[in-house]
């Protein structure tokens, strides 16, 4: 056990050790009790032993010698196993276009040297995924850079120089994908001091959404080292993690096509924005049209949604249907319509915060309603809720992760529908996953346009 | 609804104790850092106490500091000020308000109690 | 005494442009951005303004802050009977163990 000496050197090392875990691997220190040995000795090893095989040590459950360099290692102060503070936003920014600011800057560098770094950061991932970045000077950006020391405004100090070189916090309002630069570090453009480049990469990687890697080649591994910036590229794993976020460059999937042409049903990158049944036929959305799939027949035919429903609007997001009622319920950013009997109800559109979202729901990403239970379910994020539609009211122990309940699916759907008495139909990009909810797993995997014969 | 409701205040002795809640309701209670500021009569604002979205991170004010305790439950969505040897001073109306960060500052506040 | 020094009171007739001005040092203004909080008589205070100028959702343009060096100063253009309240400026501040700082509050008067 790691409390076997009461030299002060050793004493020095577990409390030092103590702190490390408490930061960035979740060990309750109000849970060790010094004087109960054993106790506290065994809830330390175990973290000894995660962070161990997180970073890719021996794993010893001892704070042996490269367990304390490692500890000692300059790094970013995001935990590696829990998140730094997860933001109401989710786990993903939910548009392509994404501004940041720089609020300060540091003494180290010249302004234009950190503006190109910064700028060269937003790059790396801009080149992977489809995102988009445009510095902006004034007003609130999504992202904001700031140099700052010590207690800077965020309940999360700096500690002085080496140690935590920089944190970044999760997309969402706020403080969310903001991104903070320790000012007791020596910011360079070299291998001298820190790398403002390569520190940047990383946070931004944050500020996107992305966890720590236990991957040593990872530009997302949570300790700083130095690698040649005119020859740094993303890991594989970097790229898997923020392309499995938002897809890649060519995947533009969640923006409207540019010119609003009609998409290629079989094309084999189809995703859609929404789907739901409407009695014995299928209505798949995407942008201002829809296709009408009648259940068992070939044949399917693409609509302008306005031809159908004038008053509604495109790029409906989310939809379900309560059969019994004859009701579909369409859902686009924080409103939805009522349809009855395939019209649009008066009185609409109402505000999703009726149906007793909180207010950092701003939008439904996918809804589908089971008749065996009668409830609706709600997909935000990575994160769904659960409204029962006799009570007309959520149920309560919601919001919950999609990843822990529907194995296999998520973290984040575009859409989903019910059919044959036992089958979710979940989307998610140009993949289709059917769901037997009494079984409680995937059954089968297809393209999403699979409906269509393609 | 963002909500803050607080609740436990009362009259008491000096050198007696209290102990506020604040319940949340509406918003992901755990992602956000909480407060308290007291208000006495007649009088301005003042910063009591905070603590991080964890818990694992708090700070006082030098007037309270050694005599008040701040903590949260996140599975109850509920703040607390555990308030000691309590003096005529501390005489105020208590305010739990969400948020806290220097940039964002506190955006949403309970009524009072 | 406060860390912050805001006018006691200030008053406008409606329609008018009134300011507030709030000072303060380098461990404070001089290094933090300042948020404005608006108590409207036997409520809650509320967010008016935060980071120096920026305005929440649903409080009205005619709500501006700005900031410079270690001052700050809340502008209330188009003043309206229903803005007569207690204003008060805060910020964190490096050199206290406890990070916020609030001004003393000054009061609106809307003649």
């Known amino acids: 056990l790691p409390l076997n000496s009461s030299t002060s050197l050793e004493k020095n090392n577990v409390l030092f050790g103590e702190r490390y875990l408490e930061k960035f691997y979740g060990l309750e220190i109000n849970k060790l009790p010094v004087t109960k040995m054993k106790y506290s000795g065994n809830l330390m090893k175990e973290k000894i032993q995660e962070m161990q095989h997180f970073l890719g040590l021996k794993v010893t459950g001892q704070l042996d010698t490269s367990t304390l360099e490692m500890m000692h290692a300059p790094r970013c102060g995001v935990p590696d196993v829990h998140h730094f503070r997860e933001m109401p936003g989710g786990p993903v920014w939910r548009k392509h276009y994404i501004t940041y600011r720089i609020n300060n800057y540091t003494p180290d560098m010249n302004r234009e040297d950190v503006d190109y770094a910064i700028r060269k950061a937003f790059q790396v991932w801009s080149n992977v995924t489809p995102l988009k970045f445009s510095k902006i000077n004034t007003g609130m950006a999504d992202i904001l850079v700031v140099f700052a020391r010590g207690a800077h405004g965020d309940f999360h100090a700096f500690d002085g120089k080496g140690g935590i070189l920089a944190h970044a916090f999760g997309p969402g309002s706020g403080i969310g994908g903001d991104a903070h630069f320790d000012e007791d570090e020596f910011w360079t453009t070299h291998s001298g001091g820190t790398n403002l480049f390569l520190t940047a990469v990383h946070e931004i990687g944050h500020s996107l959404g992305l966890g720590h890697s236990s991957d040593p080649k990872a530009v997302m591994f949570p300790t700083y080292k130095y690698v040649d910036i005119n020859t740094f590229r993303l890991s594989a794993d970097d790229i898997r993690g923020i392309q499995s976020l938002y897809g890649d460059p060519k995947e533009n999937q969640r923006l409207p096509n540019p010119d609003n042409s009609e998409p290629a049903l079989c094309d084999p990158n189809l995703s859609f924005d929404a789907v739901t049944t409407v009695g014995n036929k299928i209505f798949f959305f995407k942008d201002r049209f829809f296709w009408l799939k009648v259940s068992e027949r070939p044949k399917t035919s693409v609509n302008l949604i306005s031809s159908l429903w004038p008053t509604l609007p495109s790029g409906i997001e989310a939809a379900y249907e309560i059969e019994a009622r004859n009701q579909v319920f369409l859902f686009k950013d924080d409103k939805y319509w009522l349809i009855s009997n395939l019209r649009p109800e008066p009185n609409y559109p109402k505000s999703i915060h009726s149906f007793g979202f909180p207010n950092f729901v701003k939008k439904i990403d996918a809804a589908v309603f089971n008749p065996r239970f009668y409830r609706t379910y709600f997909f935000v994020d990575n994160q769904y809720w659960r409204y029962d539609e006799r009570r007309q009211m959520m149920d309560p122990g919601y919001p919950k992760l999609i990843t822990k309940n529907f194995q296999g699916i998520g973290p984040k759907i575009d859409a989903v529908f019910y059919s044959k008495n036992k089958y979710y139909y979940f989307f998610q990009g140009s993949n289709q996953f059917e769901y037997d909810f009494l079984l409680q797993r995937i059954t089968k995997t297809l393209k999403s346009n699979s409906w269509f014969g393609c | 609804e963002v909500q803050l409701l607080e609740s436990g205040g009362g009259l008491v002795q000096p050198g007696g104790s209290l102990r506020l809640s604040c319940a949340a309701s509406?918003?992901?209670?755990?992602?956000?850092?909480m407060q308290w500021v007291r208000q006495a009569p007649g009088k301005g604002l003042e910063w009591v106490s905070g603590?991080?979205?964890?818990?694992?991170?708090?700070m006082y004010a030098d007037s309270v500091k050694g005599r008040f305790t701040i903590s949260r439950d996140n599975s109850k969505n509920t703040l607390y000020l555990q308030m000691n040897s309590l003096r005529a001073e501390d005489m105020a109306v208590y305010y739990c308000?969400?948020?806290?960060?220097?940039?964002?500052?506190?955006?949403?506040w309970g009524q009072g109690t | 005494q406060s860390a912050l020094t805001q006018p006691p009171s200030t008053s406008g007739t409606p329609g008018q442009r009134v300011t507030i001005s709030c000072s303060g040092s380098?461990?404070?203004?001089?290094?933090?951005?300042v948020n404005w909080y608006q108590q409207l008589p036997g409520a809650a205070p509320k967010l008016l303004i935060y980071?120096?100028?920026l305005r929440p959702s649903g409080v009205p343009d005619r709500f501006s802050g700005s900031k410079s060096g270690t001052s700050a100063s809340l502008a209330i253009s188009g003043l309206q009977s229903e803005d007569e309240a207690d204003y008060y400026c805060?910020?964190?501040?490096?050199?206290?163990?406890?990070?916020?700082?609030f001004g003393g509050g000054t009061k609106l008067t809307v003649l």
């Open positions: 308000a969400r948020g806290g960060d220097s940039l964002y500052g506190m955006d949403v």
């Open positions: 509406g918003f992901t209670f755990s992602v956000y850092p």
């Open positions: 603590i991080s979205s964890s818990g694992g991170f708090t």
């Open positions: 380098g461990s404070n203004i001089g290094s933090n951005p």
């Open positions: 980071s120096n100028d």
């Open positions: 805060a910020a964190w501040d490096y050199s206290l163990n406890g990070p916020w700082v």
